[in-house]
C-alpha cells in the first residue's frame, strides 16, 4: 500500500475528525471485522464537533489488520507522546489508514499547529491544494494553490507543507498565505 502524504491542510479538510491524542494501549484485533483497534486518550479535538457532539470522547482508533490493505502500524512505544490524528468516521468510529495524516505533535512546525488549531478550516470550503507531481503543471482554477513540495523534497518536509496554507484572498481566488505571520 503506497500513497503520497497529503498537505496537512488537505488532510484536515478531507477528514471527518482531527484530534490530538496519545496511543495508550496494545492494539487488539476484532475478529468479526479483522480490523485492529488502538486505545487512545484524546487530549484535544480540532474538527468533528458537529459529527460527534461536543461531549464525545474518542477512546479507540480503527485500522485494517494488515499492512498490504493500508493498515496503520503505530511504531512509537512512548505512551505519553501526543499525536495529531486526522481520520474518517465510519459508524461513529474513528478510522485511519497508512494514508491518513498521523504525526507526532512535537514534529509539527508552529505554523502547522496553528493551521490545525485555527487556520486550515478557513480554506476548506473554497480552496484546494493542488499537487504538482511533474513539470509542467498549471492551475486549473483560481481557487487552487499549486503544491510543488514533492518536486523539491519529501512532501511532508517541504516549505509549503510546513509554513503555508491555501486561503481565500477574495471571492474565487485562493493563494498561499504564511501561517507564520498569523501566529500571535
Amino acid at each position: 500500500c503506497t500513497c503520497v502524504p497529503p498537505h496537512p491542510q488537505t488532510a484536515f479538510c478531507n477528514s471527518d475528525l482531527v484530534i490530538r491524542a496519545k496511543f495508550v494501549g496494545t492494539p487488539e484485533v476484532n475478529q468479526t471485522t479483522l480490523y485492529q483497534r488502538y486505545e487512545i486518550k484524546m487530549t484535544k479535538m480540532y474538527k468533528g464537533f458537529q459529527a460527534l457532539g461536543d461531549a464525545a470522547d474518542i477512546r479507540f482508533v480503527y485500522t485494517p489488520a494488515m499492512e498490504s490493505v493500508c493498515g496503520y502500524f503505530h511504531r512509537s512505544h512512548n505512551r505519553s507522546e501526543e499525536f495529531l490524528i486526522a481520520g474518517k468516521l465510519q459508524d461513529g468510529l474513528l478510522h485511519i489508514t497508512t494514508c491518513s495524516f498521523v504525526a507526532p505533535w512535537n514534529s509539527l512546525s508552529l505554523a502547522q499547529r496553528r493551521g490545525f488549531t485555527k487556520t486550515y478550516t478557513v480554506g476548506c470550503e473554497e480552496c484546494t491544494v493542488f499537487p504538482c507531481l511533474s513539470i509542467p503543471c498549471k492551475l486549473q482554477s483560481g481557487t487552487h494553490c499549486l503544491w510543488t513540495d514533492q518536486l523539491l523534497q519529501g512532501s511532508e518536509k517541504g516549505f509549503q507543507s510546513r509554513h503555508l496554507a491555501c486561503l481565500p484572498r477574495e471571492p474565487g481566488l485562493c493563494t498561499w498565505q504564511s501561517l507564520r505571520s498569523q501566529i500571535a
Epitope: P27, V29, Q31, T32, T33, A65, E67
Partner: antibody, heavy 113, light 111 residues
Framework: QVQLVESGGGLVQPGGSLRLSCAAS????????MSWVRQAPGKGLEWVSV????????YYADSVKGRFTISRDNSKNTLYLQMNSLRAEDTAVYYC??????WGQGTLVTVSS | DIALTQPASVSGSPGQSITISCTGT?????????VSWYQQHPGKAPKLMIY???NRPSGVSNRFSGSKSGNTASLTISGLQAEDEADYYC??????????FGGGTKLTVLG
C-alpha cells in the same frame, strides 16, 4: 465443546482444483475470524488464509494469492477453501483453525501426476 | 519462509524445567499480545498449549507457562514428563503477513 472438522482433501493433478470444507460447532461461529493453515510432509506450519467473522475481509499468504479463495457460510457454520491451479508444492495437510487458538484434525491434499 | 526464530531442538531430563524461546520483531511478537504455543506429536494435529502470550486453555497442565519480553516470547515446561516429548511451535499475529509461525522446536525428554 468446540470442534472443527475438515473434509474434501484427496489426490489431484497439477493444475487441478479442490474445495475444502470445515464444519464448526460449539461456539458462535460468526463472531470469530477463521484461518486455513497447512503443513507440508515433514515441514513446519504455514498460514494460508483468513476470513473475518462477518466474511467481509479476507487475506492470503503470497504463496496462494490469486489461486485460493476463502469463504464462509455463517448460516451453516462452515468454512471453505477453494483451491485452483494446484501445484506440487501445495501438497500438505490443511488445517482449519479459529483465529489463534482451536484447530481441526486436518485433511490431506496431495498434488501429483 | 520462517518468520519467528525458535531453537531447532531442546532436551531435558524428567522433572527438570526447560524453556523454548521464540524471537520475532515489533510487527509481530513485540507489537501485540497475540502469541500462541502449540504441541504436536507425530502424525497428530497441533494442540493449543498457550494463547495470548500467557493464558492456558482449560485442560492444559499448569506445568506449561508462557511469557514475553520485548520481541521474544518464551514457553516454559516445568516438571518435564515423557509425554511432553513433541514438536513445539510458536505462532504470532503479524501486521505484515497476518499470521506467522516459528520453525518448530523438537523437545527430547532424556532417559
Amino acid at each position: 465443546q468446540v470442534q472443527l472438522v475438515e473434509s474434501g482433501g484427496g489426490l489431484v493433478q497439477p493444475g487441478g482444483s479442490l474445495r475444502l470444507s470445515c464444519a464448526a460447532s460449539g461456539f458462535t461461529f460468526n463472531s470469530y475470524a477463521m484461518s486455513w493453515v497447512r503443513q507440508a510432509p515433514g515441514k513446519g506450519l504455514e498460514w494460508v488464509s483468513v476470513i473475518s467473522g462477518n466474511g467481509s475481509n479476507t487475506y492470503y499468504a503470497d504463496s496462494v494469492k490469486g489461486r485460493f479463495t476463502i469463504s464462509r457460510d455463517n448460516s451453516k457454520n462452515t468454512l471453505y477453501l477453494q483451491m485452483n491451479s494446484l501445484r506440487a508444492e501445495d501438497t500438505a495437510v490443511y488445517y482449519c483453525a479459529r483465529f489463534l487458538d482451536i484447530w481441526g484434525q486436518g485433511t490431506l491434499v496431495t498434488v501429483s501426476s | 519462509d520462517i518468520a519467528l526464530t525458535q531453537p531447532a531442538s531442546v532436551s531435558g531430563s524428567p522433572g527438570q524445567s526447560i524453556t523454548i524461546s521464540c524471537t520475532g520483531t515489533s510487527s509481530d511478537v513485540g507489537g501485540y499480545n497475540y502469541v500462541s504455543w502449540y504441541q504436536q506429536h507425530p502424525g497428530k494435529a497441533p494442540k493449543l498449549m498457550i494463547y495470548d502470550v500467557s493464558n492456558r486453555p482449560s485442560g492444559v497442565s499448569n506445568r506449561f507457562s508462557g511469557s514475553k519480553s520485548g520481541n521474544t516470547a518464551s514457553l516454559t515446561i516445568s516438571g518435564l514428563q515423557a509425554e511432553d516429548e513433541a514438536d513445539y511451535y510458536c505462532q504470532s499475529y503479524d501486521f505484515v503477513r497476518f499470521m506467522v509461525f516459528g520453525g518448530g522446536t523438537k523437545l527430547t525428554v532424556l532417559g
